[in-house]
């Protein structure tokens, strides 16, 4: 079926926006006001996936910009990238699996788990203006939890 | 060679839980969905629901709330259990390995077991 | 949930004939389509997936089209071995659904 997809922003637990930082990265502080308009907008595709009735699959793409959300082993570590696609391709119902992220909802909060690897997580840091990363650990000092706003298209 | 074998009691009483294993080889289970599916005596096939190779499991809204798949890798084993009966689930029930083909046939069952019959009655 | 209706639900053929048999999914669903063959006492075998696909060691009589809501499934020449019942199943989303079967009788 045609992928179906949303537009949307997330902000992390501690109500940290997301923002681009240089072409391939993003990171995580508080903005306010006019500054709002700096997050990005998220295009979330909801793609096949290992679904169960707690997970839902889905695509993380900036809106608009032929870049996806994946996850990838660099120096034997699980890492999030922002990586470049054919727009004519993408997004797609059947997105290679380092794209697709389960979206899990426990208590009107998000996380987003790497269906790549398993138990590792989109990620923010407890410090302002640090880059979103996938990280390994839930319930410590690192953020997993998010919020979804919904963006009208 | 992939292979998968149902077991499990013939005969179940009503109001108790059907309880069935199904045992594969040929292929891991921490690398392959299985799926559960039924058929009544007689009639078409239906979907019960799947355990992927991560341990989630999706189960399908009619039975959901009746319905537990688990697994042991180790024993490679995949086990399904039905509670509170009825001689409406009386069927055959199959269990089938997932294609898991990312970006390609996630979802597809290629391997079937062949079966067993479980009959609901006092 | 999408619905398959899968038509005819019996059919009455003779060995050397052509049979189709149809399904059509309630949504979009790709080229997301499976088809099997159960014999009586027998588990449902895979015959063609991806609408199209035939499985390694599958006859070559035995093919699919389609894509989107409509898809065929033709057997271009019966053989005795052929007669048995016929299944469609979408596999493009959780939970997946079978048509209601297809009856292939000798006339």
């Known amino acids: 079926a045609p992928v179906r997809s949303l537009n949307c922003t997330l902000r992390d637990s501690q109500q940290k926006s997301l923002v681009m930082s240089g072409p391939y990265e993003l990171k995580a502080l508080h903005l306010q006001g006019q500054d709002m308009e700096q997050q990005v907008v998220f295009s979330m595709s909801f793609v096949q996936g290992e679904e169960s009735n707690d997970k839902i699959p889905v695509a993380l793409g900036l809106k608009e910009k032929n870049l996806y959300l994946s996850c990838v082993l660099k120096d034997d570590k699980p890492t999030l990238q922002l990586e470049s696609v054919d727009p004519k391709n993408y997004p797609k119902k059947k997105m290679e699996k380092r794209f697709v992220f389960n979206k899990i909802e426990i208590n009107n909060k998000l996380e987003f788990e790497s269906a790549q690897f398993p138990n590792w997580y989109i990620s923010t840091s407890q410090a302002e203006n640090m880059p979103v990363f996938l990280g390994g650990t839930k319930g410590g000092q690192d953020i997993t939890d998010f919020t979804m706003q919904f963006v009208s298209s | 060679e992939v292979q998968l074998q149902e077991s499990g009691p013939g005969l179940v009483k009503p109001s108790e839980t059907l309880s069935l294993t199904c045992t594969v080889s040929?292929?891991?289970?921490?690398?392959?969905?299985v799926s559960w599916i039924r058929q009544p005596p007689g009639k078409g096939l239906e979907w019960i629901g799947l355990?992927?190779?991560?341990?989630?499991?999706y189960y399908n809204s009619p039975l959901k709330s009746r319905l537990t798949i688990s697994k042991d890798n180790s024993k490679s084993q995949v086990s399904l259990k039905l509670s509170s009966v009825t001689a409406a689930d009386t069927a055959v029930y199959y269990c089938?390995?997932?294609?898991?083909?990312?970006?390609?046939?996630?979802?597809?069952?290629?391997?079937w077991g062949q079966g067993t019959l479980v009959t609901v009655s006092s | 949930d999408i619905q398959m209706t899968q038509s005819p639900s019996s059919l009455s053929a003779s060995v050397g004939d052509r049979v189709t048999i149809t399904c059509q999914a309630s949504?979009?669903?790709?080229?997301?389509m499976n088809w099997y063959q159960q014999k009586p006492g027998k588990a449902p075998k895979l015959l063609i997936s991806?609408?199209?696909t035939l499985r390694p060691g599958v006859p070559s009589r035995f093919s699919g089209s389609g894509s989107g809501t409509d898809f065929t499934f033709t057997i271009s020449s019966l053989q005795p071995e052929d007669f048995a019942t016929y299944y469609c199943?979408?596999?493009?989303?959780?939970?997946?659904?079978f048509g209601q079967g297809t009856k292939l009788e000798i006339k």
């Open positions: 089938a390995k997932q294609r898991n083909l990312w970006g390609f046939d996630l979802y597809g069952m290629d391997y």
């Open positions: 949504q979009d669903i790709d080229d997301d």
């Open positions: 199943l979408q596999s493009d989303s959780l939970p997946l659904t």
């Open positions: 355990i992927w190779g991560s341990g989630d499991t």
């Open positions: 991806l609408a199209s």
């Open positions: 040929g292929f891991s289970l921490s690398d392959f969905g």
